[in-house]
């Protein structure tokens, strides 16, 4: 014969545990029902009556099956540098993430506790590591033969245009200026932008003078977050 299904509350067999979505009440010494997400225990179970659950009040929530006497309070409203990516409901807490152009400098279990503006690289420096949701941009000096003339958290150093006849040589913060004959670009037209979020980073010391032989050039990408330094500016 099939074993009888026990209905809560019931006394568990010695050495056994309560079933899924049940908990053991020490006072009643019975297996009792948990409350579903969005509810809390209004009245705990006894030997003869099961848990009585009630809905969470406004601005409170429970995310899991539970037997807590009160629902948890939702976090405070998102600050001006954040966006609400998950609203406070009876079943989930509010989640705030940093808005575009900012990154999370101090995270919490879900979402972000403190957002900071992405660093901006000043002219002569380019983004060497795009920012992410949790890391700042890194700036580095433009290498010989490249430049950046912007203060930006998204612009990388770009090669100088190649002139048939140079009117003004380029430097780290300015492109070469050609005489009226049309220049040939060493790159496709249009600025290269990094995706948001991004911010910028330290840059210091002038790049070393152009070596007598042009360097072969290659590139990889940048790296982890770091504090602002000379080459970067605040927002």
């Amino acid at each position: 014969l099939p074993a009888q299904v026990a209905f809560t509350p019931y006394a568990p067999e010695p050495g056994s545990t309560c079933r899924l979505r049940e908990y053991y009440d020490q006072t009643a010494q019975m297996c009792c029902s948990k409350c579903s997400p969005g509810q809390h225990a209004k009245v705990f179970c006894t030997k003869t009556s099961d848990t009585v659950c009630d809905s969470c009040e406004d601005s409170t929530y429970t995310q899991l099956w539970n037997w807590v006497p009160e629902c948890l309070s939702c976090g405070s409203r998102c600050s001006s540098d954040q966006v609400e990516t998950q609203a406070c409901t009876r079943e989930q807490n509010r989640i705030c993430t940093c808005r575009p152009g900012w990154y999370c400098a101090l995270s919490k279990q879900e979402g972000c506790r403190l957002c900071a503006p992405l660093r901006k690289c000043r002219p002569g420096f380019g983004v060497a590591r795009p920012g992410t949701e949790t890391s700042d941009v890194v700036c580095k000096p433009c290498a010989p033969g490249t430049f950046s003339n912007t203060t930006s958290s998204t612009d990388i150093c770009r090669p100088h245009q190649i002139c048939n006849v140079v009117a003004i040589p380029g430097n780290a913060s300015m492109d070469a200026v050609c005489t009226s004959t049309s220049p040939t670009r060493s790159m496709a037209p249009g600025a290269v932008h990094l995706p948001q979020p991004v911010s910028t980073r330290s840059q210091h010391t002038q790049p070393t003078p152009e070596p007598s032989t042009a360097p072969s050039t290659s590139f990889l990408l940048p790296m982890g977050p770091s504090p602002p330094a000379e080459g970067s500016t605040g927002d």
Epitope: T132, K140, C142, A143, C157, V192, Q203, S218, L220, S226
Partner: antibody, heavy 118, light 109 residues
Framework: QVQLVQSGAEVKKPGASVKVSCKAS????????IHWVRQAPGQGLEWIGR????????EYAPNFQDRATMTTDTSTSTAYLELSSLRSEDTAVYYC???????????WGQGTTVTVSS | QAVVTQEPSLTVSPGGTVTLTCRSS?????????ANWVQQKPGQAFRGLIG???DRAPGVPARFSGSLLGGKAALTLSGAQPEDEAEYYC?????????FGGGTKLTVL
């Protein structure tokens, strides 16, 4: 002129560690990342990771996260790569480089051959 | 870890045009992958040709160009020269690390 000079060839037993050095000259080492890349015999390039000499921040390829350690000594303008728990598949030429996707500051060391054999 | 795939080998006639491609296992290649192309000639140092998908590095001849084609990064060589015979590697950026492709052996024949 810019130069990256690496330490000499190494022969190691499986399970051992190796530390390769890369001395930079001709530029300010803190201005550009140092990358480590390897090439096994007859194989392509494999990116190991990158270190920022300015602050020591590192990023590693997922496959090397647990075994590789990159450091720099700015006082001597030297970068180091240490690889632990060596196995035969780690036999390769290891290169240090300033090759960095945004910088166009592209210099490579001469390579250090690491042989792992019992 | 993402896998980056290139054609193992390609052949081009002198003066001809050839396109090498670079595919990502995680989906279409975008400008956020900052595709780079690196050249390796036997017995010579590596040399970066293209960065940021389509920027030619200083000193790189105009016959090399980078682009995105059909969800892949592409390196096009127009007017191939015998000295362009080499191994070509692409590298793609994935948020906090680079991944190289297996390389394409280009023969100019």
């Amino acid at each position: 002129q810019v130069q990256l000079v690496q330490s000499g060839a190494e022969v190691k037993k499986p399970g051992a560690s190796v530390k390769v050095s890369c001395k930079a000259s001709g530029y300010t080492i803190t201005d550009f990342y140092i990358h480590w890349v390897r090439q096994a015999p007859g194989q392509g390039l494999e990116w190991i990771g990158r270190v920022d000499p300015e602050d020591g921040n590192t990023e590693y390829a997922p496959n090397f996260q647990d075994r590789a350690t990159m450091t720099t000594d700015t006082s001597t303008s030297t970068a180091y790569l240490e690889l632990s728990s060596l196995r035969s598949e780690d036999t390769a030429v290891y290169y240090c480089s300033t090759w960095d996707g945004f910088s166009y500051f592209d210099y490579w060391g001469q390579g250090t051959t690491v042989t792992v054999s019992s | 870890q993402a896998v980056v795939t290139q054609e193992p080998s390609l052949t081009v006639s002198p003066g001809g045009t050839v396109t090498l491609t670079c595919r990502s296992s995680t989906g279409p290649v975008t400008t956020n992958n900052y595709a780079n192309w690196v050249q390796q000639k036997p017995g010579q140092a590596f040399r970066g040709l293209i960065g940021g998908t389509n920027d030619r590095a200083p000193g790189v001849p105009a016959r090399f160009s980078g682009s995105l084609l059909g969800g892949k990064a592409a390196l096009t060589l127009s007017g191939a020269q015998p000295e362009d015979e080499a191994e070509y590697y692409c590298a793609l950026w994935y948020r906090n690390h680079w991944v190289f492709g297996g390389g394409t052996k280009l023969t100019v024949l």
